[in-house]
Amino acid sequence: VPRWRQQWSGPGTTKRFPETVLARCVKYTEIHPEMRHVDCQSVWDAFKGAFISKHPCNITEEDYQPLMKLGTQTVPCNKILLWSRIKDLAHQFTQVQRDMFTLEDTLLGYLADDLTWCGEFNTSKINYQSCPDWRKDCSNNPVSVFWKTVSRRFAEAACDVVHVMLNGSRSKIFDKNSTFGSVEVHNLQPEKVQTLEAWVIHGGREDSRDLCQDPTIKELESIISKRNIQFSCKNIYRPDKFLQCVKNPEDSSCTSEI
C-alpha cells in the first residue's frame, strides 16, 4: 500500500539535489584555494541533516548551524553587494568586478543557488514531488529558513560601504517583504556599516526618471537612517553600458552618467 504523502503547493526538490550540492562544493573549493580545506562530504552531511526526517514546515535556523559552521568563510566586509529582485545583473557584475561579492559568490550561497529541497517528517526520504510554498504553505520551510540564515549572517558581516542593487522596473523598488527588506536591512551593524548605497537599475531605455525619489526608496532611506547608517542612492540608467564600463573603465563613453 503506497504511503500517504503530504502534497505541498511548491515545486519539489530539484532533481539530483545531493549530487548537485556535492558537485558544486567540489567545484567551489577547487576554484577558491582558501576554501580548499573544506570537506565536501561533511558539508553535504550537514546540509542533509538540516532538513532530512524533519517536518518541512518546522525548520529552524538552529537546524542549519552545523552547515553554517562548516561553511564559515571570510569575505572582505567592505566589498559586499546585496541585491533584491535583480539577481542576474548582480551576479554578472561580480563576475566582472571580481573583488566584490554577492551572497551567491560565497560557498553556502553558491551551493544552494536556484535549488529547492525538503524532506518528510520521520523518513529519510527527500521529497522530489512537492515542497512547501512560503506563502501558501508555511514560511519555516527548509529553503526559506536557509536563505534567511545565510542572508542574516552575510549582512552581519558587512562593513564600511555596503552596496545594494535594486530593480527599478518593479512596482516596489524596495520591498519590505523581500529577503533584503526583511532580513538584510535589519542585520547591517551600525557600528561597522557607515553607508548603504543603493543602485537602482532602470529597465526602459528611455527611462530618465530619478528613481531615487521613489516612495519605496524614501522608505528604505528612513529605515536605514533610523538605524544610524547613512544612505545614498544612484540611478543606473543603462545597465548594459554599466556592465560594459565595469569591464572597460577606460572607454571614453564611460565618463558620462550611466
Epitope: T20, A23, H37
Partner: antibody
Framework: EVQLQQSGAEFVRPGASVKLSCTAS????????MHWVKQRPEQGLEWIGW????????KYAPKFQDEATLTADTSSNTAYLHLSSLTSEDTAIYYC??????????WGQGTLVTVSA | DIVMTQSPSSLSVSAGEKVTMSCKSS????????????LAWYQQKPGQPPKLLIY???TRESGVPDRFTGSGSGTDFTLTISSVQAEDLAVYYC?????????FGGGTKLEIK
C-alpha cells in the same frame, strides 16, 4: 549514472588543428569543472587544465597555456579541447575528467590524436 | 610545480604476494587548514582510462577492494596491495591533488609473474 563520452580518434597532419569533444551525462557541467589530461604513448599523465562551463573561466598548466584552448557549450552539456599547430609531440590520448570529492573520479574513454605526415 | 617521483618504475611479483610502491612529492601535500594530505592514487589497465583508487592519501574510493591501502603524509606516500591478484596488472600513478598545476608521478608498472 555519470558518464563522459569523448569523440572518436583523429589522424591529422603537422601544423593542422583539431577540436575534441567530451559530452557529459548524469550531471550538469555547469556544476563542475571539466578537466583535460594528456597521455603520450607509453608515457605518464599530464594535466592540461580546466574550464568552468558556467562562466567560461579557464585555468591551464603553464606548459599548455599557449597550446590548448578549452571551451564548453552548456546547452549540449559538452566540453571541448582545441589543439592548434600540431606536431608529433601532440600525438597522445586526451582524456576529459571530472573531480569528485578529491581526485579525478570520472574519466572519459579517451581520444587518440595521431599527428603524422 | 610540484614534482612527483615514483619508485620503482616497475616490479614483477607472484599472485598472493604483498606489494608496496612509493611516491615522493617535492613539496608537502598536507593542507594546513584540515591536516589532510591531498594525494591521489590511480590504477590504469592497458587500453583503459585511469581509475581512482585512493584519495586524501588514505581514503579508498567506493568499490575499491580493501587489499589496496594508501598511507603516508607530507611528502612521502605509499600504496600497498596486501595480496596481489592477476587483475591488478596495471600502471599505478600518484597525483598531487594539493595545488595547481596538478601533477602526476611517472608511474609504477606492476607485472604478475
Amino acid at each position: 549514472e555519470v558518464q563522459l563520452q569523448q569523440s572518436g580518434a583523429e589522424f591529422v597532419r603537422p601544423g593542422a588543428s583539431v577540436k575534441l569533444s567530451c559530452t557529459a551525462s548524469g550531471f550538469n557541467i555547469k556544476d563542475s569543472l571539466m578537466h583535460w589530461v594528456k597521455q603520450r604513448p607509453e608515457q605518464g599523465l599530464e594535466w592540461i587544465g580546466w574550464i568552468d562551463p558556467e562562466d567560461d573561466k579557464t585555468k591551464y598548466a603553464p606548459k599548455f597555456q599557449d597550446e590548448a584552448t578549452l571551451t564548453a557549450d552548456t546547452s549540449s552539456n559538452t566540453a571541448y579541447l582545441h589543439l592548434s599547430s600540431l606536431t608529433s609531440e601532440d600525438t597522445a590520448i586526451y582524456y576529459c575528467a571530472r573531480r569528485f570529492l578529491r581526485g579525478f573520479a570520472y574519466w572519459g574513454q579517451g581520444t587518440l590524436v595521431t599527428v603524422s605526415a | 610545480d610540484i614534482v612527483m617521483t615514483q619508485s620503482p618504475s616497475s616490479l614483477s611479483v607472484s599472485a598472493g604476494e604483498k606489494v608496496t610502491m612509493s611516491c615522493k612529492s617535492s613539496q608537502s601535500l598536507l593542507n594546513s587548514g584540515n591536516q589532510k594530505n591531498y594525494l591521489a592514487w590511480y590504477q590504469q589497465k592497458p587500453g583503459q582510462p585511469p581509475k581512482l583508487l585512493i584519495y586524501g592519501a588514505s581514503t579508498r574510493e567506493s568499490g575499491v577492494p580493501d587489499r589496496f591501502t594508501g598511507s603516508g603524509s607530507g611528502t612521502d606516500f605509499t600504496l600497498t596491495i596486501s595480496s596481489v591478484q592477476a587483475e591488478d596488472l596495471a600502471v599505478y600513478y600518484c597525483q598531487n591533488d594539493h595545488s595547481y598545476p596538478y601533477t602526476f608521478g611517472g608511474g609504477t608498472k606492476l607485472e604478475i609473474k
